[in-house]
Interface confidence: low
Amino acid sequence: EVEKTACPSGKKAREIDESLIFYKKWELEACVDAALLATQMDRVNAIPFTYEQLDVLKHKLDELYPQGYPESVIQHLGYLFLKMSPEDIRKWNVTSLETLKALLEVNKGHEMSPQVATLIDRFVKGRGQLDKDTLDTLTAFYPGYLCSLSPEELSSVPPSSIWAVRPQDLDTCDPRQLDVLYPKARLAFQNMNGSEYFVKIQSFLGGAPTEDLKALSQQNVSMDLATFMKLRTDAVLPLTVAEVQKLLGPHVEGLKAEERHRPVRDWILRQRQDDLDTLGLGLQG
């Protein structure tokens, strides 16, 4: 907490400029008007303030806006954003995607911090749903963002937003998250032709039910083993040997290498040995 002291004669700041880096903390507190700071926030990032000086500037804004900063200030916080606590951010009402992008840029290259997570949460809640533009932005900064959401939160993602999802965005999703995302993807891509559809839906198939896998097996999709191994065990179990053979196409030979792993192991155990023998892979049920 900086002591309240009078501003020395001639030191009253008329604008936010580089001369302020020579001010001691108490001088910044006494000589910089909070309202001036708020209107010239865009200049702060161009000035090499120390962390201690930034603390003073934050303190001044906190005093000016005890109920939370207005978006006009938030958009220009820049590196001062790194000084904010999740509690500070919970007071904000961020509605502009440009503001979100500006603050995410400050944290770029780093893990998602509690501050960023709170900011995103406030933004998405303010919008009411995770629209395509927001999802595009968030996954660009944080490829794992989608998989950081709970299944309940994912349920608010509209199918139209699924077009923004890239395969790498789903890398860390757990099975229950894919259970929620898959039906949305199926709806989003429903008007695509067979081969294009499979390319798009492939990343989401960890949430696919048996009947959809059976349908895919009739379309010569040649699913790779990596995708097959991510399928739900309970969805794979009812598939016949012929259906798995059609689903995998030339990749069916890879079953041998995966015979001790789920879901292949569980599937093999439920097949008749004479059916397995038709594959010529030496699989033992």
Epitope: E152, D174, R176, R232, D234
Partner: antibody
Framework: QVQLQESGPGLVKPSETLSLTCTVS??????????WSWIRQPPGKGLEWIGY???????NYNPSLKSRVTISVDTSKNQFSLKLSSVTAADTAVYYC???????????WGQGTMVTVSS | DIQMTQSPSSLSASVGDRVTITCRAS??????LNWYQQKPGKAPKLLIY???SLQSGVPSRFSGSGSGTDFTLTISSLQPEDFATYYC?????????FGGGTKVEIK
């Protein structure tokens, strides 16, 4: 085969934080197929799911406990952990760690550890 | 949250009896229903997953059936080691929830 072992203090004071660790042996906490859960059972009562974590660090908590729970994973030690803050006597229970397989069932459980909240 | 209601809460039976325990979900959970057996001082043990699939190593006298909201666990011929408490659990959506349990006692 995969085995789970809980460890941590058996006595925690009210308002403090309960911390437990589950060590996975004979398998990997980094398995893409599995979710790692904490479940508790107060004396003489039924089972309550606390939350789970995926190898990637993605978590899902029971809303009734969400504000007090943190589950984390340490893939280098093949462990996952539970922290429950601001405990009261109502948090006295046997705490189990369990593996939820791809079939959606808890197929492997630790033996459980009794945690008593008392001053 | 999905509520799981088990009935009866307890029952008395003799060795060799056929025992049926029911579990009802407050909304449809497809086939995402598991059954566990718990003995005093021990961790629960998985018996049935996905409503009707028998877990490896579990005796075939245990069977499960049902889909949607109504499920049944059947023990075709009760054995001395089967006296325990049985729990159902849904894995359809989070929070994952358990039934209140059914205690099977010796008559």
């Amino acid at each position: 085969q995969v085995q789970l072992q809980e460890s941590g203090p058996g006595l925690v004071k009210p308002s403090e934080t309960l911390s437990l660790t589950c060590t996975v042996s004979g398998g990997s906490v980094s398995s893409r197929d599995d979710l790692w859960s904490w479940i508790r059972q107060p004396p003489g009562k039924g089972l309550e799911w606390i939350g789970y974590i995926y190898y990637s660090g993605s978590t899902n908590y029971n809303p009734s406990l969400k504000s007090r729970v943190t589950i984390s994973v340490d893939t280098s030690k093949n462990q996952f952990s539970l922290k429950l803050s601001s405990v009261t006597a109502a948090d006295t229970a046997v705490y189990y760690c369990a593996r939820e397989g791809k079939n959606g069932a808890f197929d492997i459980w630790g033996q459980g550890t009794m945690v008593t909240v008392s001053s | 949250d999905i509520q799981m209601t088990q009935s009866p809460s307890s029952l008395s039976a003799s060795v060799g009896d056929r025992v049926t325990i029911t579990c009802r979900a407050s909304q449809s959970i497809s086939s995402y229903l598991n059954w566990y057996q718990q003995k005093p001082g021990k961790a629960p043990k998985l018996l049935i997953y996905a409503a009707s699939s028998l877990q490896s190593g579990v005796p075939s006298r245990f069977s499960g059936s049902g889909s949607g909201t109504d499920f049944t666990l059947t023990i075709s011929s009760l054995q001395p080691e089967d006296f325990a408490t049985y729990y159902c659990q849904q894995s359809y959506s989070t929070p994952l929830t358990f039934g209140g349990g059914t205690k099977v006692e010796i008559k």
